[in-house]
């Protein structure tokens, strides 16, 4: 039994809905009495959902799962998975049983986009050209790691000087706190990017310093 | 057959400095965050450094290494580098290179080289 | 920096015996720990990651348990392949990421 699932993972921001696609050809005259639909989590077997004897045996996974059962007859042995959370991430196996027998296992990517970063600037008064300033970049509750890029007011690249610590933090989101260390010049616009890989999605922040005072677009 | 392959190690004189190299191959490079873990003669292992997947990606590193080392990587080769300069008889020890457990994440090291063996001594 | 203590330095069982392994969080770090299974003169392998989620390959005998910082390693039954070095690693914080100072199982 040839059972198919999308080759791609299957992105979902964090508290959305996610439907895993799962699909079987019955052959004619096929009956979902003779169905056995078996999901579960790919490395620990943990069984997420299931539907045997005509029945839908409802949820083991916090009940959070939902199957499609105006579409199991026409071979759509789909799984809904409802207000996804960081710990969803993985691997799930879709093992389809009616005489013959077949599984697939599709990959849950889940993620959440960083806030908009906040720029603080220390020191952040009577400052001069020549001054070193610490310029700190804080995005919370993203998810995947983020890369974090910094870049002046000409849009190059700042990379010396750098430290960027991300922490997971109860819900497995991430904060990102990113320092740089500049020496100021006249003046000057430093900007900081917080980039999710997987969402492809940049979150900008910036302070520009013009002797007095500083603004923070 | 997922891969890393390092080379670069040598004997090298205190204050000198050695390039390694981590060849990946049988998995899609650019989506991994890659380390560089050390393990000194019969002692445990110990994080060097660290970069995140992009081109030119964040560079992380060990107090013990920041301003000597700097770690790199080439999407297109492949390829993830560790330049070791001013290097000390403390940083003798067996390198490897390792890539996270799942793609755009940097926790857990299921894939390891070999270990390419660097030497400090006068 | 997140400093990881592992207990007992080394541990002296016979083949067959179950094994118990602990690394302690010097602050909170939920799940975020891997376990790590090194033989002389090979590269680490990745056992248990989150805490208690078994690797790819990784037998059944191999658990681990805890969260927040208290953590364990369980083989079940020691068969003559276990006997290694054994290291905890955090990743809820960093860099940097941390190792433990490693658990040795040798043969009694």
């Known amino acids: 039994l040839e059972v198919q699932v999308p080759e791609d993972p299957v992105v979902a921001l964090v508290g959305t809905d996610a439907t895993l696609c799962c699909s079987f050809s019955p052959e004619p005259g096929f009956s979902l009495a003779q169905l056995n639909l078996i999901w579960q989590l790919t490395d620990t077997k943990q069984l997420v959902h299931s539907f045997a004897e005509g029945q839908d045996q409802g949820s083991a996974y916090a009940n959070r799962t939902a199957l499609f059962p105006d579409l199991l007859a026409q071979g759509n042995a789909s799984l809904r998975l409802q207000r996804v959370r960081v710990a969803d991430e993985g691997s799930f196996t879709c093992f389809v049983s009616i005489r013959d027998f077949g599984s697939a296992a599709v990959s849950l990517q889940v993620a959440a986009p960083y806030s908009k970063p906040s720029m603080t600037l220390e020191p952040n008064k009577d400052l001069r050209p020549g001054d070193t300033v610490t310029i700190t970049c804080s995005s919370y509750r993203g998810y995947p790691e983020a890369e974090v890029f910094w870049q002046d007011g000409q849009g190059v690249p700042l990379t010396g000087n750098v430290t960027t610590s991300q922490m997971a933090n109860e819900q497995g989101l991430f904060d990102v706190h990113s320092v740089l260390r500049v020496v100021l010049g006249a003046n000057g616009t430093y900007s900081c990017l917080v980039r999710n890989p997987v969402l492809q999605q940049d979150a900008h922040g910036s302070v520009t310093i013009t002797g007095q005072p500083m603004t923070f677009p | 057959e997922v891969q890393l392959l390092e080379s670069g190690g040598d004997l090298v004189q205190p204050g000198g400095s050695l390039r390694l190299s981590c060849a990946a191959s049988g998995f899609n490079f650019s989506s991994y965050w890659m380390s560089w873990v050390r393990q000194a003669p019969g002692k445990g292992l110990e994080w060097v450094s660290g970069?995140?997947?992009?081109?030119?990606?964040?560079?992380y590193y060990a107090d013990s290494v920041k301003g000597r080392f700097t770690v790199s990587r080439d999407n297109s080769k492949n390829t993830l580098y560790l330049q070791m300069n001013s290097l000390r008889a403390e940083d003798t020890a067996v390198y490897y290179c390792?890539?996270?457990?799942?793609?755009?994440?940097?926790?857990?090291?299921?894939?390891w080289g070999q270990g390419t063996t660097v030497t400090v001594s006068s | 920096e997140i400093v990881l203590t592992q207990s007992p330095g080394t541990l002296s069982l016979s083949p067959g015996e179950r094994a118990t392994l602990s690394c302690r969080a010097s602050q909170s770090i939920r799940s975020d720990l891997a376990w790590y299974q090194q033989k002389p003169g090979q590269a680490p392998r990745l056992l248990i990651y989150g805490a208690s989620s078994r690797a790819t390959g990784i037998p059944a005998r191999f658990s681990g348990s805890g969260s927040g910082t208290e953590f364990t390693l369980t083989i079940s039954s020691l068969q003559s392949e276990d006997f290694a070095v054994y290291y905890c690693q955090q990743y809820n914080n960093w860099p940097p990421l941390t190792f433990g100072g490693g658990t040795k199982v040798e043969i009694k």
């Open positions: 390792g890539r996270d457990r799942s793609p755009y994440q940097y926790r857990s090291m299921d894939v």
């Open positions: 970069i995140s997947i992009s081109y030119g990606g964040n560079a």
